[in-house]
């Protein structure tokens, strides 16, 4: 189980996974860009089983999903931190 918590840098991800997570197991995804005291982009996946996983932003599967989300929300202006519920 991957740990997620706040550090003095306000980064939350201690470990990152690149493993594909099927959509039916995902509750929501939070994408935090660099900044706000954390020098790296963080992607946090909340799963329906109540566990939380930090995903490597370079992982191919999450980039594909992010691209899909970008296309879906292209009509709305970007926000610095957002959560997307996975249908």
């Amino acid at each position: 189980v991957l740990e997620v918590y706040y550090t003095h840098l306000r980064c939350r991800c201690v470990q990152e996974s690149s493993v594909f997570i099927p959509r039916r197991f995902i509750d929501r995804i939070q994408i935090s860009p660099r900044g706000n005291g954390c020098p790296r982009k963080e992607i946090i996946v909340w799963k329906k089983n109540k566990s939380v996983v930090c995903v490597d932003p370079q992982a191919e599967w999450i980039q594909r999903i992010m691209e899909m989300l970008r296309k879906k929300s292209s009509s709305t202006p970007p926000v610095p931190v957002f959560k997307r519920k996975i249908p």
Partner: antibody, heavy 120, light 107 residues
């Protein structure tokens, strides 16, 4: 050590019913999705369906959902497959498998299989 | 349903050979693909998950690659115990589906 011990297979007549069981040990059964998969003679693996930990979500292969019912009893650490209106094409080896949703997201543990033969 | 097509029903090989099995999905499954091995009289065993990750205890002669619709499973140096049927499976979405299987046999 994780074990999935299957039982309940056997000979059943066309149109009949049968209930397969899969008893889990060595895992916190109530935390995991579980699946049923079968392999007919000379054929490949076919997914039957899956059930989530609290039984609130059950997904079936569309062609099988009207004749098979997947259930579980977490108090008994046991998964079930109720088969009804069976036909000769349901003759197969039936496997239960853990559908991991923590680390691998694939079927990482399998039962030994139980044979079902549909014949008059 | 997503159809997983394994182009070869069987493949002949020799001990020490490098062999690759291909699998094509009928639609994009991202990297939601696993590979299993089934020996006669045994249950399937998970070898590869998330298209390219080796499952615990799986020797490094087994590798997987691909994303989207095209996937490959490779054994870099076939051993006698590798003679079995290999299945790809997509777990991107339900219904989960398997390829028809590729039987690896000796020449």
């Amino acid at each position: 050590e994780v074990k999935l011990l299957q039982s309940g297979g056997g000979l059943v007549q066309p149109g009949g019913s049968l209930k397969l069981s899969c008893a889990a040990s060595g895992i916190d059964f109530s935390r995991y999705w579980m699946s049923w998969v079968r392999r007919a003679p000379g054929k490949g693996l076919e997914w039957i369906g899956e059930i989530n930990p609290d039984s609130s979500t059950i997904n079936y292969a569309p062609s099988l959902k009207d004749k098979f019912i997947i259930s579980r009893d977490n108090a008994k650490n046991t998964l079930y497959l109720q088969m009804s209106k069976v036909r000769s094409e349901d003759t197969a080896l039936y496997y239960c498998a853990r559908q991991d949703d923590y680390e691998y997201y694939a079927m990482d543990y399998w039962g030994q299989g139980t044979s079902v033969t549909v014949s008059s | 349903d997503i159809v997983m097509t394994q182009s070869h029903k069987s493949m002949s090989t020799s001990v020490g050979d490098r062999v690759s099995i291909t699998c094509k999905a009928s639609q994009d499954v991202n990297t939601g693909v696993a590979w299993y091995r089934q020996k006669p009289g045994q249950s399937p065993k998970l070898l590869i998950y998330s298209a390219s990750y080796r499952y615990t205890g799986v020797p490094d002669r087994f590798t997987g690659s691909g994303s989207g619709t095209d996937f490959t499973f490779t054994i870099s140096s076939v051993q006698a115990e590798d003679l079995a049927v290999y299945y790809c499976q997509q777990y991107y979405s339900t219904p989960l589906t398997f390829g028809a299987g590729t039987k690896l046999e000796l020449k």
